[in-house]
């Protein structure tokens, strides 16, 4: 945020940039949290725009019985590994085809035991406040589907009649990692020493990090004709004086007519 300065007073202004603002020869360049000619004002809204998508990664192990393990499968650049990867990926794409959050699989390791496949199932969803629930549900469906396929697609008389066959008991979910996005935490951190006074409110499922000085939200402070200003002790209303009235009170809702004061009478609206 920048405020431009013209004229002789500019050099003076340079040494007076506040709150970590820096002079660039024309104006004070203010850090994210501040604005104003001298960076003296605290912003009322901080952009904590969420990521467009949130990801989850499930570490799974399955045992493929329709392929016999060979040493070449350890080498990720071998023809054997590449072919196995292609078939396994196609098979898993079929298994998880009904899960909208499913992105794909990534084989991390193949080892002996028929072929034990250590792999990640990758999930992704559009950010909404309910993303945790969406991804939790998706991971449950992944577990159900992989359990089902490894129970159904099994070798009969030493031959597999499916794209791949599995050992029913070789299916394990090792770990589930969900990308953490905590708008409240981000908001508090970015508001720094004003963190106690900034809150997250949602509009169209998008989080907004705002102080009570930002109008139009449920926590917004109504300063009436005054101006809301943030200080280290919280939001305060700076009341104005017009030609006819002085305004006072916590929300500048008390107007005193100047003529009455000059006539030694007080009158409150």
């Amino acid at each position: 945020r920048t405020t431009t300065c013209f004229g002789d007073g500019c050099q003076n202004t340079a040494s007076r940039c506040k709150n970590g603002g820096t002079w660039d020869g024309l104006k004070c360049q203010c850090p994210n949290l501040y604005y104003g000619e001298l960076c003296e004002e605290v912003v009322s809204s901080i952009d904590i725009g969420p990521p467009e998508t949130i990801s989850a990664q499930m570490e799974l192990t399955v045992t493929v019985t329709s392929v016999k393990f060979t040493e070449e499968l350890k080498n990720h650049s071998s023809q054997e590994f590449q072919e196995f990867k292609q078939t396994f990926t196609e098979q898993m794409n079929i298994v998880y085809s009904g899960i909208p959050e499913y992105v794909g699989v990534n084989i991390t390791k193949l080892r002996l035991g028929s072929v034990v496949v250590e792999h990640d199932v990758l999930l992704r969803t559009k950010y909404t406040p309910e993303y945790k629930t969406v991804l939790d549900n998706a991971t449950e469906v992944v577990k159900e589907k992989i359990t089902k396929v490894t129970t159904q697609q099994i070798m009969i008389n030493d031959i597999c009649s499916d794209m791949m066959c599995f050992n029913t008991t070789g299916t394990q979910v090792q770990n589930i990692t969900v990308t953490q996005y905590d708008p409240e935490e981000d908001c508090r951190k970015m508001a720094k020493e004003y963190g106690d006074y900034f809150v997250v409110e949602y509009r169209d499922q998008k989080p907004y990090c705002i102080s009570p000085c930002e109008p139009g939200f449920s926590v917004s402070k109504n300063c009436n004709l005054g101006k809301c200003q943030m200080s280290l002790s919280g939001p305060q209303c700076l009341c104005v004086t017009t030609e006819t009235h002085w305004y006072s009170g916590e929300t500048c809702n008390q107007g005193t007519q100047k003529s009455l004061v000059y006539g030694h009478h007080h009158h409150h609206h």
């Epitope: 016999k68 070449e72 023809q79 196995f84 196609e90 009649s161 499916d162 794209m163 791949m164 066959c165």
Partner: nanobody, 123 residues
Amino acid sequence: DVQLVESGGGLVQPGGSLRLSCAASDNTFSRGSMSWFRQAPGKEREGVAIISSDGWTGYADSVKGRFTISQDNAKNSLYLQMNSLRAEDTAVYYCAASFLVLRALNPKAWHYWGQGTMVTVSS
């Protein structure tokens, strides 16, 4: 690029025999697997027989005891000896190969294919 070429198809009477051959462009599959599939008119492709580099062989129930799969690694060739042929054996026969030591007779498990050779069993 891997190439597989089948030969040996033709017209044969019920009860007769036929030997199919498949020539691979190199010996790439000597450490993997090779197989025969067939596709009758209007039907899905189905597995017939499989042989792996470890010597293991497997057959579809419908051909067990009648067909024999074998390979000659020195000649990079695969064979299918078909005896006691029946009308229902009529189909296009395909050779398939894999770098993997497979135990699967599902066409989706196989990545490399020949163009096929026609076998007609009819009197």
